[in-house]
Interface confidence: low
């Protein structure tokens, strides 16, 4: 007899792991044999869909390789034309080990801003997400929270938040770890120690000190009255993200010195500035009152004769003192090409030390004249013959200009080293050096009528002369 369909085994909830097989059974009793159709989420499953296998006259539905998208309500419907159609439904719960679908990435962030490290996960049951910083589980606090999505949010990022992070997704089926990522916290440049203002005497050395920090470590530049510092020496050291810069200056004029700390954040820069003034006590322009100023010798004619980085007096009665004095010594130097080998080194030393006198910095920069004894040694001992010839020429008016006369001192007007040893300059080139004597040609003249300590009195002795330029 015809019989309407009856589903004898209603569908149940099926749990299946991804890539596993899942089977729904829909046993039907009826006569004639029913037609059985299947739906997923009310959408008909087509018989020729290769992801499914339908057997036993449609009573068995097998999902051959479960995907996470197969989750849903599956229904079977049986109809044989006798009575109405019958339906039974069951759920497929796709169980899934945790999977991190959007892992965290390296982040560079400026201190004080908000950082979000993403960590989006999949899994069934829904995984719980936690974070590890370094080697330890990250504890949430008022600034740090794991969002519903699994992402880590850090408010008001601090330097101590920098480090290595990874997220962990966990459910009953397993655990997934993200790769380790780096959170780098960048800090705007900040000056820790500003340079101090100074009030100093003319010609003093001053060191301005500026300390800055930041991430990355900033660079420090110095500005003098709005321009890059053109003189002075800068020493820098970096320790524990702190840069220390010292600018040593030789002060010949007042100025505003600015320390600028700069660091880079992506395409942008951050800067911090601090300024200090250097004023000169009882400042009056050297050109007006002091008749000159002290400066390091940076010419070329006397650089083998004067001490390295010698502080020399530049006479501001010339429009361009450095140039004029160099020209003066240059002109006279050329005349020394013809003098005797005995005279020449001594004359060069006298010439350079007379034109570029040693300078005593102070409120009033003061030239230190050559000691009379050294001048007389050149005149009467080393260069007696040449000196006489030169004086003769002078009397006869053979010199075209007075220039060379300015470069020859009048020994009698110079201070003696016996009056005040600090008031006059010695010529080390003429001092006897027992360790390293450089022998002059034998002298035939008798003992000079000057008293120079350490100058030997015998005619066979040696004198120390610093090497001078080759005049070829």
């Amino acid at each position: 007899l015809p019989k309407a369909p009856v589903i004898t085994t209603p569908l149940e909830t099926v749990d299946a792991l991804v890539e596993e097989v899942a089977t729904f059974m829909c046993a039907v009793e009826s006569y004639p044999q029913p037609e059985i159709s299947w739906t997923r989420n009310k959408i008909l499953i087509k018989l020729f869909d290769t992801r499914y296998s339908i057997r036993e006259n449609g009573q068995l539905l097998t999902i051959l390789s479960v995907e996470d998208s197969d989750d849903g309500i599956y229904c079977c419907t049986a109809n044989n034309g006798v009575g109405g159609a019958v339906e039974s439904c069951g759920a497929l719960q796709v169980k899934m080990k945790p999977k991190i679908t959007r892992p965290p990435i390296n982040v560079k962030i400026i201190e004080g801003l908000k950082a979000v490290l993403p960590c989006t996960t999949m899994g069934n049951p829904k995984p719980s997400v936690s974070w590890i910083k370094g080697d330890s589980p990250l504890r949430e606090n008022s600034r740090t929270a794991v969002l519903e999505s699994g992402s880590l949010r850090i408010h008001n990022v601090q330097k101590e938040d920098a480090g290595q992070y990874r997220c962990v997704a966990k459910n009953s089926l397993g655990t997934a770890y993200s790769k380790v990522v780096k959170l780098e916290v960048e800090v705007f440049a900040r000056i820790l120690r500003a340079p101090e203002s100074h009030n100093v005497t003319f010609g003093s050395f001053v060191t301005l000190h500026c300390t800055a920090t930041g991430i990355p470590v900033p660079t420090i530049t110095w500005i003098e009255n709005g321009n890059a510092v053109s003189s002075g020496s800068i020493q820098e050291s970096v320790k524990d993200r702190v840069i220390d810069s010292r600018l040593q200056l030789f002060i010949t004029k007042p100025g505003l010195y600015t320390c600028i700390a700069t660091n880079k954040h992506g395409e942008k820069f951050s800067t911090a500035k601090a300024a200090a003034t250097v004023s000169i006590a009882e400042w009056s322009k050297p050109q007006k009152d002091n008749k000159g100023y002290c400066a390091q010798y940076r010419g070329e004619v006397c650089n083998a004769v004067l001490a390295k980085d010698a502080l020399v007096f530049l006479n501001t009665s010339y429009a361009d003192p450095e140039e004029a004095q160099e020209l003066l010594v240059h002109t006279a130097w050329n005349e020394l090409k013809v003098v005797s080998p005995l005279c020449r080194p001594a004359a060069e030393a006298l010439l350079c030390n007379h034109v570029f006198q040693e300078c005593s910095p102070g409120v009033v920069p003061t030239p230190i004249p050559i000691c009379r004894e050294y001048c007389l040694a050149v005149k009467e001992l080393f260069c007696a013959k040449e000196w006489l010839a030169m004086e003769e020429k002078t009397h006869r008016g053979l010199y075209r200009s007075e220039m060379h006369l300015l470069s020859v001192p009048e020994c009698s007007k110079l201070p003696s080293m016996h009056w005040d040893p600090t008031a006059c300059a010695r010529l080390p080139h003429l001092d006897y050096n027992k360790e390293n004597p450089k022998t002059f040609p034998p002298m035939t003249s008798s003992k000079p009528s000057v008293d120079i300590p350490n100058l030997p009195s015998s005619s066979s002795s040696s004198f120390s002369v610093s090497p001078t330029y080759s005049m070829t």
Epitope: A228, E300, N303, E326, Y469, S470
Partner: antibody
């Protein structure tokens, strides 16, 4: 009449060497500083090197330091530029120039006509 | 390394006045840079015009004068003539740890 005559230019392969000379006449050579200045085809002037009157010190543009050597022989009244490890960017007309005698680097008050150096493979 | 800047090109009418300038990419040009000016006509070697800011080389006409104006060196040609059409270069002495001499990129002056 003051004259500066450069020689020694030519075609050289990258990595090669050349020695330029500049013969001076008509002035007291050993009283003046000298310089080499170059000019790439269609480009501006570029200071290369300088030497004072006595050869006591030498100065170079940063990009040629360690490759070029300036020297002078005052007896022969000649300035030299030894160029090693030449690069294509060294291609230029090289001028020898006399300094005006001021300290530091001084103006260049007399120039030679130049010698062409071509660095190419 | 500081860059020396000049106007790429300028023009002047015969008899007119033109000022060429020479600046520094970072900072001001001062007399301590001893600004020098050179003239170069096509196919010729350069020739010195002005040295140390405002001094004329011998044989240079008085219509060429040098100065420092504001934060730049300046070359002024007063009463320009057709033969003044040339490239003009400034040269600056630099001292920042080591001595250096740097030319500007040059100004092409056209006398219309």
């Amino acid at each position: 009449e003051l004259q500066l005559v450069e020689s020694g230019g030519g075609l050289v392969q990258p990595g090669g060497s050349l020695r330029l000379s500049c013969a001076a006449s008509g002035f007291t050579f050993d009283d003046y500083g000298m310089s080499w200045v170059r000019q790439a085809p269609g480009k501006g002037l570029e200071w290369v090197s300088a030497i004072p009157w006595n050869g006591g010190s030498t100065y170079y543009k940063e990009s040629v330091k360690g490759r070029f050597t300036i020297s002078r022989d005052n007896a022969k009244k000649t300035l030299y530029l030894q160029m090693n490890s030449l690069k294509s960017e060294d291609t230029a007309v090289y001028y020898c120039a006399k300094r005006s005698g001021r300290i530091a680097f001084g103006a260049l008050d007399a120039w030679g006509q130049g010698t062409l150096v071509t660095v190419s493979s | 390394q500081a860059v020396v800047t000049q106007e790429p090109s300028l023009s002047v009418s015969p008899g007119g006045t033109v000022t060429l300038t020479c600046g520094l990419s970072s900072g001001s040009v001062t007399s301590s840079n001893y600004p020098d000016w050179y003239q170069q006509t096509p196919g010729q070697a350069p020739r010195g015009l002005i040295y140390s800011t405002d001094s004329r080389h011998s044989g240079v006409p008085s219509r060429f004068s040098g100065s420092i104006s504001g934060n730049k060196a300046a070359l002024t040609i007063t009463g320009a003539q057709s033969e003044d059409e040339a490239d003009y270069y400034c040269g600056l002495y630099m001292y920042s740890g080591s001595k250096n001499y740097v030319f500007g990129g040059g100004t092409k002056l056209t006398v219309l």
